[in-house]
């Protein structure tokens, strides 16, 4: 069964810009990836980007760019005002959903401040599985 990982990385030189990286470990056919966040604007879940293997990518503010990093991982870059960034991100959780075949949907979420840039193994804060 594939394992989804998520990491959130602040840019060292620019506190208003950061990236969400997520991927799936192991052997699975990816048909769709959705990156979203919770607690950023309101209590609901906000869709940041959708990445389709063939049809391309779509992103919504504050996401600035979404792209595939490898055949089984993606990256979404977000940009916002510095004051808003500091206040809004404290309670924000970022989630990545991978729709794969034949395993179905796999979701992993990560709080911004629980991400360790030097992490060498996937340790999702939350791993929801819905087949």
């Amino acid at each position: 069964s594939p394992e989804v990982w998520v990491q959130v990385q602040m840019e060292a030189t620019n506190l208003s810009s950061f990236s969400v990286h997520c991927g799936v470990l192991g052997y699975s056919l990816i048909s769709l990836v959705t990156v979203s966040c919770e607690g950023f604007v309101d209590a609901g879940r906000t869709k940041l980007a959708v990445l389709h293997p063939e049809f391309g990518t779509q992103q919504w503010a504050p996401a600035r760019q979404a792209h595939w990093e490898t055949p089984n991982s993606v990256s979404v870059t977000l940009t916002m005002g510095q004051s808003k960034a500091r206040s809004s991100l404290a309670n924000t959780t970022f989630c990545c959903e991978f729709v794969t075949f034949p395993h179905g949907s796999r979701v992993a979420c990560r709080d911004l401040h629980r991400s360790d840039p030097g992490l060498s193994a996937p340790t999702p804060a939350l791993n929801l599985q819905a087949d």
């Epitope: 990982w5 990491q7 990385q9 990236s19 990286h21 991927g23 470990l25 052997y27 699975s28 056919l29 990816i30 293997p53 063939e54 391309g56 990518t57 792209h67 595939w68 990093e69 490898t70 055949p71 089984n72 991982s73 840039p117 030097g118 992490l119 060498s120 193994a121 996937p122």
Partner: antibody
């Protein structure tokens, strides 16, 4: 234009480990994955695994799971591949290559490649 | 794992010949297929990516086609520098290479 330069040839004893390095120059290192591919003498190409340097997370081919460790050091723009419990069948040229793609679709290919590192396993 | 089967494993041809190499995937891989050329003692060189896109700097006599499970690399007029081994590679689920096709001088 990114260039990948690998460490020199190694001779190892069965049961030991080898660590091969791959240094990138002339472009951004952390934003693209680095794959490792091996080729035994007279044989075909075999993908071993890859790593995304910016997050340090590696994906491995099932065949090498548990025996290979791929790491990256962003500060030196260098990727490493360590293979343990070496046996004679591991004698091969080991290549690193950059996972290159357009980004907006899931199409990826290997370009450029390192020059290769010959690892000989012999008692 | 996805298996990639290349045929033929070797072929003999003359300069000026039209050469066709086929690659078959064990399951559909859409157009996630790349072709490489390798000469003895050298690293592989990318020729074709995404089944049919010619890599920058590669001569136009090389072309790729196919989707799903069946793919073809064609060299329209073989040149002396084209004698080498050719590999296909799928990038749909992780990566797998075909066994290679050695193109030799007749």
């Amino acid at each position: 234009q990114v260039q990948l330069v690998q460490s020199g040839a190694e001779v190892k004893k069965p049961g030991s480990s080898v660590k091969v390095s791959c240094k990138a120059s002339g472009g951004t290192f952390s934003s693209a994955a680095i794959s490792w591919v091996r080729q035994a003498p007279g044989q075909g190409l075999e993908w071993m695994g890859n790593i995304i340097p910016i997050v340090g997370i590696a994906n491995y081919a099932q065949k090498f799971q548990g025996r290979v460790t791929i790491t990256a050091d962003e500060s030196t723009s260098t990727a490493y591949m360590e293979l343990s419990s070496l046996r004679s069948e591991d004698t091969a040229v080991y290549y690193c290559a950059r996972d290159t793609g357009r980004g907006y679709t899931r199409h990826f290919w290997f370009d450029p490649w390192g020059q290769g590192t010959l690892v000989t396993v012999s008692s | 794992d996805i298996q990639m089967t290349q045929s033929p494993s070797s072929l003999s041809a003359s300069v000026g010949d039209r050469v066709t190499i086929t690659c078959r995937a064990s399951q559909s891989i859409s157009s996630y297929l790349n072709w490489y050329q390798q000469k003895p003692g050298k690293a592989p060189k990318l020729l074709i990516y995404a089944a049919s896109s010619l890599q920058s700097g590669v001569p136009s006599r090389f072309s790729g086609s196919g989707s799903g499970t069946d793919f073809t690399l064609t060299i329209s007029s073989l040149q002396p520098e084209d004698f080498a081994t050719y590999y296909c590679q799928q990038s749909d689920i992780l990566y797998t290479f075909g066994g290679g096709t050695k193109v030799e001088i007749k």
